[in-house]
């Protein structure tokens, strides 16, 4: 990574305003499928791409109001093995469901110190952060 | 999202040293399996789970020195259908291999405009930037 | 200034569905930031999380009593209200509804700071 | 989930003694919140993020820690102090908040 400052002042720089986050509005990003019941592991044949596939999963939120993204999305299996894509119900013991992890940059709101040991505003923090993207239909390893 | 400032200043507040990055030095994510040669559509026994999926993937790099993460990783199909679990070559048209994508929060580097119009360090504008995560094998959609 | 008050059934009867009403003032619930939770104590107990409700609308419940509990909000009449189905003998206790939303220089905080006084519920037939 | 353990449960200390609280996570957490709860009435904020003193709250009362192990300090005791206190923390996957088992602080 470059070097790139971390720190904000805490007051009126340049301006109250500019110190929104300064973007287009974006709303808070939910998986079409955020769905905390209970699901069947099955494979549907319509909706979204974690209902649709032979590895289904569901998403879980991770909430944190000091970190950039606030909002974070881990995935959950619904199956042990895949789901046979004949029926779409049925598991197939010859594959596996796993997650799939991926470290996301991160950034944490932190206390800044000053010189003097007082307070200058915040820090963001960069942070590698594990989330799980979604489960993989996959062989299962052959140990050599 | 709540409102977080934006804007930095560019000369030493609190100081230059607090301005870099303060976190644990992390090495840029490399994927464990990133290969831009060209690979078979097929579904392996070992190695990571892109290879091992049977709906098999490869990583192409994204760089932008101006956006955190600098280096983003875009997931590519190496198949249009599933590999059957059966033989791990063989493509089954009962499945199709869809990639999954992903709205991940970016920010880039922008210029900060004072009150007067002169540049006053720069400011991170938060984005959503669409990424490929991985393919996933999925029961093609029937439609109503 | 800030306050909440908690409202509902003194006695329930087991099985039955007990609904709590907090009655707030002095904060919106729509302000980015904001959230309300509700928290029990059974007599000469610790105090147990239950459940939680942000500005926008996202809940988050204790996992093991999730199938049990409903929290739902209306910002308009200042008021947030919690459901707990098939109630037990277990469930007696003083039920506190309590704000979060303080942000300040270092950061938002997770700490309930302002509370109700808190409403006992008893469970028996 | 994490749990929280407090130590003591129970603690008996005389006006001007200097008292100290601990709370242990099981597993690595950043920060830990206090309240101090009397009988009959609701808790009341203490300590916020681990070291700041909540609005009001005189400073013989001092937090500080990290990782699983937090401490509350009271550095004099006073006859207001002897209630009991809770630690808190929020965990952000799955979103919950946990609170400590108490620790009733007696008059000896």
């Known amino acids: 990574y470059s070097h790139w400052p971390s720190c904000c002042p805490s007051k009126g720089y340049p301006s109250e305003e500019l110190l929104r986050w300064s973007t287009v509005p974006v709303p808070p990003l939910k998986p079409a499928s955020l769905d905390f019941h209970s699901v069947s592991c099955r494979a549907s044949e319509d909706g979204p791409l974690n209902s649709r596939a032979i590895s289904p999963w569901r998403y879980e939120l991770d909430r944190d109001l000091n970190r950039l993204p606030q909002d974070l999305y881990h995935a959950r299996c619904l199956c042990p093995h895949c789901v046979s894509l004949q029926t779409g119900s049925h598991m197939d013991p010859r594959g596996n469901s796993e997650l799939l992890y991926h470290n996301q940059t991160v950034f944490y709101r932190r206390p800044c110190h000053g010189k003097k040991g007082n307070h200058k505003g915040y820090c963001l923090e960069r942070r590698l952060y594990r989330v799980s993207l979604a489960c993989v239909c996959v062989r299962p390893r052959v140990m050599g | 999202y709540s409102h977080w400032p934006s804007c930095c200043p560019s000369k030493g507040y609190p100081s230059e040293e607090l301005l870099r990055w303060s976190t644990v030095p992390v090495p840029p994510l490399k994927p464990a399996s990133l290969d831009f040669h060209s690979v078979s559509c097929r579904a392996s026994e070992d190695g990571p789970l892109n290879s091992r999926a049977i709906s098999p993937w490869r990583y192409e790099l994204d760089r932008d020195l101006n956006r955190l993460p600098q280096d983003l990783y875009h997931a590519r199909c190496l198949c249009p259908h599933c590999v059957s679990l059966q033989t791990g070559s063989h493509m089954d048209p009962r499945g199709n291999s869809e990639l999954l994508y992903h709205n991940q929060t970016v920010f880039y580097r922008r210029p900060c405009h004072g009150k007067k119009g002169n540049h006053k360090g720069y400011c991170l504008e938060r984005r959503l930037y669409r990424v490929s995560l991985a393919c996933v094998c999925v029961r093609p959609r029937v439609m109503g | 200034q800030v306050t909440l008050k908690e409202s509902g059934p003194t006695l329930v009867k087991p099985t039955q569905t007990l609904t709590l009403t907090c009655t707030f003032s002095?904060?919106?619930?729509?302000?980015?930031?904001?959230?309300l939770g509700w928290i029990r104590q059974p007599p000469g107990k610790a105090l147990e999380w239950l459940a939680h409700i942000w500005w926008d609308d996202v809940k988050h419940y204790k996992p093991a009593l999730k199938s049990r509990l409903t929290i739902t909000k209306d910002t308009s009449k200042n008021q947030v209200v919690l459901t707990m189905t098939n109630v037990d003998p277990v469930d007696t206790a003083t039920y506190y509804c309590?704000?979060?939303?303080?942000?300040?220089?270092?950061?938002?905080?997770?700490?309930?700071?302002?509370w109700g006084q808190g409403t006992l519920v008893t469970v028996s037939s | 989930d994490i749990q929280l353990t407090q130590s003591p449960s129970f603690l008996s200390a005389s006006v001007g003694d200097r008292v100290t609280i601990t709370c242990s996570a099981s597993?690595?957490?950043?920060?830990m919140y206090w309240y101090q709860q009397k009988p009959g009435k609701a808790p009341k904020p203490l300590i916020y993020r681990t070291s700041n003193l909540a609005s009001g709250v005189p400073s013989r009362f001092s937090g500080s820690g990290s990782g699983t192990e937090y401490t509350l300090t009271i550095s004099s005791m006073q006859p207001e102090d002897f209630a009991t206190y809770y630690c808190?923390?929020?965990?952000?996957?799955?979103?919950?908040?946990?609170f400590g088992q108490g620790t009733k602080l007696e008059i000896k």
């Open positions: 597993s690595s957490v950043s920060y």
């Open positions: 309590a704000r979060m939303g303080q942000l300040h220089y270092y950061g938002y905080d997770y700490a309930m700071d302002y």
């Open positions: 002095g904060f919106s619930l729509s302000t980015s930031g904001m959230g």
């Open positions: 808190q923390l929020y965990h952000s996957y799955p979103p919950t908040w946990t």
